[in-house]
Structures are given as structure tokens and as C-alpha cells.
């Protein structure tokens, strides 16, 4: 007697980049003989009970091709990760994994004046944000003179894999001889956010 088989074919790239708030349709076709008995989609060790459907490609008696679709709606930055489709029949098990990355606009997590006189800005987003610094004298918040950071680090995120990437950047405020405003601008392909520190007044954050 021939041994059974399952062959899975992804209908979308197995590495997927999706923007925050968008949908994505994870779709596979698979060949199974004998007929499939169990199918499931899993994310973070949790099984989806809805949002997916599984059906034969045709209604012919001899059909061995099937389709499974997982419809992810309004994905959040915290919902990136590995989504796995598993299918089994009486002879074999098979699986395919999709790595989903959610692109998110940077958010500035902290913006501090440290005791050593450094100004530090920490931002999170995906793809990894870039942090630029600008200074403008006086009280204007239209800063154009760029300032080179003293230190830039990519921090390990405490969140799950595929989550936002955290970047920390610092500048030395002792270089500024006048009162004024310092802008920390975090940006990536999705968008940008700025925080402003006024030497004479308390800090304030203005997302753009």
C-alpha cells in the first residue's frame, strides 16, 4: 500500500511585511492523500478558532488539493511573529511557517536629560528607527542645525520577536552655549515622531 503524503505550497511569501493597521491574507494550497483529518493555524502557541477557512480546491471525488486561508485584519505592532499552518492525515504531518513583520511608525519611549549632562532619546518602531538630533537657538521649534549623537545603541526589546526595535541615542548638551530647543526626531519608512526639549522649560512631546 502506498504511503500517504502531504505537500504544502504557500500562496504568499513566507516572509511578510505588513503596515500597522493593514490586513494580510495568509494562504496555502496543499496536496494530501489520504484526505486531511486535522488542520490548524497557530500563533504564539495559540490556536486560531476562527479567522480561517479550509476547503477542497475542487469538488471532484478524486480531488487531493485543498486550500487554507488565514485572514488577519487590522494587524497591530504587537501581532508580528510566526504564524504556522499545520495539517495531518492518517499517515503524515506537515507544517509551514509565515514570518510576519508589522511596520510601525516610531514612538518616542523616553526623552531625558541625564545627570551627566547628556540628552537621551529612546524610540521604538519597525523597521528600526533612525534618530536625528537638531538644535535651534531661542524659543522656535523649527530646528534645522543638525547635531551628531555621542552614542547610538539598538536595545533588545522586551517584547516578542518580530516586535518593535528599540533605539537609544544620546547627545552632549554641554556643547550648546545658548538657551534653545533640541529636537529628537525618530523616523523610519512608515513615519516620523519628534520630541522637543526646551532648555528653559520642561520637556514636551509632539508627535507629527
Amino acid at each position: 500500500v502506498d504511503k500517504g503524503f502531504i505537500n504544502i505550497f504557500p500562496m504568499i511569501n513566507t516572509t511578510v511585511f505588513v503596515n500597522d493597521g493593514e490586513n494580510v491574507d495568509l494562504i496555502v494550497e496543499y496536496e494530501a492523500f489520504p484526505k486531511p483529518e486535522h488542520q490548524q493555524w497557530i500563533y504564539m502557541n495559540r490556536t486560531f478558532t476562527d479567522k480561517w477557512e479550509d476547503y477542497p480546491k475542487s469538488e471532484n471525488e478524486s480531488n487531493i488539493r485543498y486550500v487554507s486561508e488565514l485572514h488577519l485584519t487590522r494587524l497591530k505592532g504587537t501581532e508580528g511573529g510566526t504564524y504556522t499552518f499545520l495539517v495531518s492525515n492518517s499517515d503524515v504531518n506537515a507544517a509551514i511557517a509565515f514570518n510576519v513583520y508589522v511596520n510601525t511608525k516610531p514612538e518616542i519611549l523616553t526623552y531625558d536629560r541625564l545627570v551627566n549632562g547628556m540628552l537621551q532619546c529612546v524610540a521604538a518602531g519597525f523597521p528600526e528607527p533612525t534618530i536625528d538630533w537638531y538644535f535651534c537657538p531661542g524659543t522656535e521649534q523649527r530646528c534645522s542645525a543638525s547635531v551628531l549623537p555621542v552614542d547610538v545603541q539598538t536595545l533588545n526589546s522586551s517584547g516578542p520577536p518580530f516586535g518593535k526595535l528599540v533605539v537609544q541615542s544620546s547627545i552632549d548638551s554641554s556643547a550648546f552655549k545658548h538657551n534653545g530647543t533640541v529636537e529628537c526626531k525618530a523616523y523610519n519608512d512608515v513615519g516620523k515622531t519628534s520630541a522637543y526639549f526646551n532648555f528653559a522649560f520642561k520637556e514636551q512631546i509632539h508627535p507629527h
Epitope: 504568499i12 494580510v24 491574507d25 494562504i27 477557512e53
Partner: antibody
Framework: EVQLLESGGGLVQPGGSLRLSCAAS????????MQWVRQAPGKGLEWVSG????????VYADSVKGRFTISRDNSKNTLYLQMNSLRAEDTAVYYC??????WGQGTLVTVSS | DIQMTQSPATLSLSPGERATLSCRAS??????LAWYQQKPGQAPRLLIY???NRATGIPARFSGSGSGTDFTLTISSLEPEDFAVYYC?????????FGQGTRLEIK
């Protein structure tokens, strides 16, 4: 801002061909199952065809099977519908849409001698 | 193919009233049901997806319910701009079918 812009409609004689295009912007086109839906004048909506994100699998309504071909070019963010052997009953506004609810404004196809 | 039947075909109500539109599938479509609104000369607009989830930007007066074969769209208090044609749509088992529509008109 999400936009789906259909083009390629027009007047064609029975038995003729047309190719519709749908240019997508404002969302990650390559992640979406796309579809064509049509609406005959004064009538309801009729699903025509669908295509998976990779373009590797397609499905058609019985009324157009063997005559219409759906395809996509993810590098150009564009969906296509090749319509052959057109009939009077194919006269309709053709919409491209995502499975998730984004729709274009439609392009009118008129099949008449 | 799964058939979708909407009722009533026409519903005549006044602004401020509650509207209840029904959609029945010829076989179970689980919760894979959407509701669309269409005004003359315009493309359909998604109101509800997966039977009960409001689409982005849709006012809270629109709500959906049901699963399996019987579904309902409720508009709690009609606004003048709500008078239009409403379609239900299923997307189960790879195919997609629409109901024939319910015309909501001003009484």
C-alpha cells in the same frame, strides 16, 4: 490613503476582447487576495474572479470561466482582468477590490454591436 | 454554490427609526459575512466584516450579528445619509457571493 484605480473599460463588440487594469496604492498590495466584482446597469453585485497574493492560484465565477483571466504584477501594484469572447451580458461596471473591503470606483464595459 | 437571500427587498422607514435587514445563506458560512452600503453612482462601501466587526470609520449606529446561515444588519437610528442599497456578501470556501440587495428608502 488607499486607492484602487480601474482603467481599460470601453465599448467593444460581441466576441471582442478587453484588458482591465487596477492600479493600487496606499497599502501593501502583495499581501492581499484581490478580486474583480461587476455590476450590470440597475442590477446587484456579482463576484467575477479572485487571485491569491502570490498570483499562484485563481478562481472564477462559472459565468466567466474559460473566457476571463485574472492576473497580477506585485512589482507594479497592479491587478488585471483579460476578458475574451465578450457577450452582451458582460456589460457592467467592473470593480477591483480586496477581500478586506477596499474598492475602486469602477470602469464601465459595454458589449454591443 | 452558496446562495444569499436578503429580506425585505425594500424597506421604507423614517429618519430616527430603527432598521433591521436580514440575510440568509443556503448553507453555513460560519462568520464569513460582510455588509456593504451602496449609493447611486458610487462604489460599495464596507460596513461590517466577519458578521459583527465594524469597518474603519463606520458609525456605531451600524451593527451586525449572526453566524452560520442567518445574519442581521441593524441601524439603530436612521440618519438621512443611510438611505441606500445594502448588500450582504459571503466569502466561505474560496467563492464569493452577494445577496440581491435591500433598498432602504425614506418613508
Amino acid at each position: 490613503e488607499v486607492q484602487l484605480l480601474e482603467s481599460g473599460g470601453g465599448l467593444v463588440q460581441p466576441g471582442g476582447s478587453l484588458r482591465l487594469s487596477c492600479a493600487a496604492s496606499g497599502f501593501t498590495f502583495s499581501n492581499y487576495l484581490m478580486q474583480w466584482v461587476r455590476q450590470a446597469p440597475g442590477k446587484g453585485l456579482e463576484w467575477v474572479s479572485g487571485i491569491v497574493p502570490s498570483g499562484g492560484s485563481t478562481v472564477y465565477a462559472d459565468s466567466v470561466k474559460g473566457r476571463f483571466t485574472i492576473s497580477r504584477d506585485n512589482s507594479k501594484n497592479t491587478l488585471y482582468l483579460q476578458m475574451n469572447s465578450l457577450r452582451a451580458e458582460d456589460t457592467a461596471v467592473y470593480y477591483c477590490a480586496t477581500r478586506g473591503g477596499y474598492w475602486g470606483q469602477g470602469t464601465l464595459v459595454t458589449v454591443s454591436s | 454554490d452558496i446562495q444569499m437571500t436578503q429580506s425585505p427587498a425594500t424597506l421604507s422607514l423614517s429618519p430616527g427609526e430603527r432598521a433591521t435587514l436580514s440575510c440568509r445563506a443556503s448553507q453555513s458560512v460560519s462568520s464569513y459575512l460582510a455588509w456593504y452600503q451602496q449609493k447611486p453612482g458610487q462604489a460599495p462601501r464596507l460596513l461590517i466584516y466577519d458578521a459583527s466587526n465594524r469597518a474603519t470609520g463606520i458609525p456605531a449606529r451600524f451593527s451586525g450579528s449572526g453566524s452560520g446561515t442567518d445574519f442581521t444588519l441593524t441601524i439603530s437610528s436612521l440618519e438621512p445619509e443611510d438611505f441606500a442599497v445594502y448588500y450582504c456578501q459571503q466569502r466561505s470556501n474560496g467563492g464569493i457571493t452577494f445577496g440581491q440587495g435591500t433598498r432602504l428608502e425614506i418613508k
